[in-house]
Interface confidence: low
């Protein structure tokens, strides 16, 4: 048993048919000694007495709020929540494993930039009864610090029959410093509780492999005189950090027809600026990433040929 | 060439081979992105790489004031890579061809590293680890650990002499 | 010419809370970093913990997690500590240290070292 | 926590001799991360050396820094009447940032 925050415990149980559980001593906060009852959640019906309360913790109906009382004035509560362990793995009921870019992935995690500020998300079915609370640093063994915010519900989407909630948190590395090389990676840690269900995920990375730039922006096609090619330019992102001669973005331009079996054409550049071929119907893209380190490309921006 | 207190690089010339740099560590190893090498505990491996610190210069204010900081780190970054990739971890089995991307990498890091140090002056370069790893597959992951560093330390690297280059250039 | 301005000296009883203030005045309080560092009489100096003004963001020495709260109100350019559970030996001088951040295109870095000390307040806890 | 452990704790000098003074930490700290500060009594601490070895702004050329790893020296070439006092090493490499317990330089 250990303590998740004040008054909040959380009982670590190996989750097979018949497992003996845990026993666990709750001890009432109160310098009273005598005439001291225990109760569990809105029960009346009175558990124990006495200043400690010894009792085995095997399942869900033997966690809760733990209230003891003294002529009808409550003293102290301690929530006893389940965290389960089956065959030797933690329970991952909470959370949807979203599969990408390896399976046993719950939480994915982006950055706009090298500020050192990055959003981390994760997908749930659960719609009531759940909270989450973030942690996050910059090691593990001597930790630096890194502040996250609240996680809040960001988007709800309907799968097949089920409803999918999408949480998602922002955290800034404390001391960042964009242009040196990281050596020890963001850490991640996500406490999830469902009722009286306790989970904990974690992820870990160095901001350089999560960086996805925003799509370029202001793209502006200027047709060529006596010619089907047209210039297309383009600007960085806002968001994308500066100095752009320090922190420099590679571009991919594409030229796609309207039918998605037509052959795309491609060109990469380092200029913010390209000659193309516009075909009758196409769209021209861009997209955008970092020029020294292949992490994700951006979304890509798109204006029509005609 | 970077002369210690004194003159500044080719940056144009060395731009360029840092940039190449970068694209042929990403094509020794491109698939590094789906693997997480830290799930294998590579803090004995590779915790003794040269990295490029918040303190050492490297950033474009930290370059304007005086690049000779920085120059110094990444020229000790190079001769370690170039070191490594020249030892029995990528010499070794299981062997690389010849005109292998790694030996191309070998082949840039020890230009770069002589673009930035003229003959006869020598900048204090780090130790490399011994690390002779027994088995072929600790070798393999050994060098996935290695270069994956390395594509991050040649991305730093690159940054500095593209800033440099637009804005340090005579 | 950048300053940073202490409150008054502080006589506390064991177990209440001090509140000690810190303000910049003449520079940019954002593009700092603000660490409280503490001196008992004829000691060393202690590191408490710091607050990047900016963000808000602050980090404590484990030695202080819980008893310390270090904050920033960016509009007046001035940052607080607040010391709560106090004993006779945090019976002490409470000094300020910026530390900057190396700034370019809107991000930043920290140069870690304490370039501009406040004058510094003394604490005194006794019963 | 790095522990640094400064010596001598006193160096009794006549102005115009030489000083060193020794930092040892307990684990290696990054030069970049390593910083001397200069204190007078009933003074705030004076920035003298950032990154081992800079001088900071308005600091006299006789005060030098040095070393790495886990040694490091602040040596000042010739004492000057208003250099005795206490001074202290700190590291930023690791939190919780740490200072040595200093070193008391007093006129002999």
């Known amino acids: 048993i250990w303590e998740l925050k004040k008054d909040v415990y959380v009982v670590e149980l190996d989750w097979y048919p018949d497992a003996p559980g845990e026993m666990v001593v709750l001890t009432c906060d109160t310098p009273e000694e005598d005439g001291i009852t225990w109760t569990l959640d809105q029960s009346s019906e009175v558990l124990g007495s006495g200043k400690t309360l010894t009792i085995q913790v095997k399942e869900f109906g033997d966690a809760g709020q733990y209230t003891c009382h003294k002529g009808g004035e409550v003293l102290s509560h301690s929530l006893l929540l389940l965290h389960k362990k089956e065959d030797g793995i933690w329970s991952t009921d909470i959370l949807k494993d979203q599969k990408e870019p390896k399976n046993k992935t719950f939480l994915r995690c982006e950055a706009k930039n090298y500020s050192g500020r990055f959003t981390c998300w994760w997908l749930t079915t659960i719609s009531t009864d759940l909270t989450f609370s973030v942690k996050s640093s910059r090691g593990s063994s001597d930790p630096q610090g890194v502040t996250c915010g609240a996680a809040t519900l960001s988007a709800e989407r309907v799968r097949g029959d089920n409803k999918e909630y999408e949480y998602s948190v922002e955290c800034q590395e404390d001391s960042a410093c964009p242009a040196a090389e990281e050596s020890l990676p963001i850490e991640v840690m996500v406490d999830a509780v469902h009722k009286l269900k306790y989970e904990n995920y974690t992820s870990s990375f160095f901001i350089r492999d999560i960086i996805k730039p925003d799509p370029p922006k202001n793209l502006q096609l200027k047709p060529l005189k006596n010619s089907r090619q047209v210039e297309v330019s383009w600007e960085y992102p806002d968001t994308w950090s500066t100095p752009h001669s320090y922190f420099s973005l590679t571009f991919c331009v594409q030229v796609q027809g309207k039918s998605k079996r037509e052959k795309k054409d491609r060109v990469f550049t380092d200029k913010t600026s390209a000659t193309v071929i516009c075909r009758k119907n196409a769209s021209i893209s861009v997209r955008a990433q970092d020029r020294y380190y292949s992490s994700s490309w951006s979304e890509w921006a798109s204006v029509p040929c005609s | 060439r970077a002369v210690p207190g004194g003159s500044s690089p080719a940056w144009t010339q060395c731009q360029q081979l840092s940039q190449k740099l970068c694209t042929l560590a990403w094509s020794a190893h491109p698939l590094v992105g789906h693997m997480d090498l830290r799930e294998e505990g590579d803090e004995e491996t590779t915790n003794d790489v040269p990295h490029i610190q918040c303190g050492d210069g490297c950033d474009p204010q930290g370059l304007r004031d005086n690049s000779q900081f920085c120059l110094q780190r990444i020229h000790q970054g190079l001769i370690f890579y170039e070191k490594l990739l020249g030892s029995d971890i990528f010499t070794g089995e299981p062997s690389l061809l010849p005109d292998s991307p790694v030996a191309q990498l070998h082949a840039s890091l020890l230009g770069l590293s002589q673009l930035l140090q003229p003959e006869g002056h020598h900048w204090e370069t780090q130790q490399i680890p011994s690390l002779s790893p027994s088995q072929p597959w600790q070798r393999l992951l050994l060098r996935f650990k290695i270069l994956r560093s390395l594509q991050a330390f040649v991305a730093v690297a690159a940054r500095v002499f593209a800033h440099g280059a637009a804005t340090l250039s005579p | 010419q950048v300053q940073l301005v202490q409150s008054g000296a502080e006589v506390k009883k064991p177990g209440s809370s001090v509140k000690v203030s810190c303000k910049a005045s003449g520079g940019t309080f954002s593009s700092n970093y603000i660490s409280w560092v503490r001196q008992a009489p004829g000691q060393g100096l202690e590191w408490m913990g710091l607050?990047?003004?900016?963000?808000?963001?602050?980090y404590y020495a484990q030695k202080f997690q819980g008893r310390v709260t270090i904050t920033a109100d960016e509009s007046t350019s001035t940052a607080y500590m607040e010391l709560s559970s106090l004993r006779s030996e945090d019976t002490a001088v409470y000094y300020c240290a910026r530390s900057k951040k190396g700034m370019y295109g809107g991000w930043t870095y920290p140069l870690m070292m304490f370039d501009l000390w406040g004058q510094g307040t003394l604490v005194t806890v006794s019963s | 926590d790095i522990v640094l452990t400064q010596s001598p704790a006193t160096l009794s000098l006549s102005p115009g001799e030489r000083a060193t003074l020794s930092c040892r930490a307990s684990q290696s700290v990054s030069s970049n991360y390593l910083a001397w500060y200069q204190q007078k009594p009933g003074q705030a601490p004076r920035l003298l050396i950032y990154?081992?070895?800079r001088r900071a702004t308005g600091v006299p050329a006789r005060f030098s820094g040095s070393g790495s790893g886990t040694d490091f020296t602040l040596t000042i070439s010739s004492l000057e009447p208003e250099d005795f006092a206490t001074y202290y090493c700190q590291q930023t490499s690791n939190t919780p940032f740490t200072f040595g317990q200093g070193t008391k330089v007093e006129i002999k």
């Open positions: 607050i990047d003004p900016n963000f808000g963001g602050a």
């Open positions: 990154y081992a070895s």
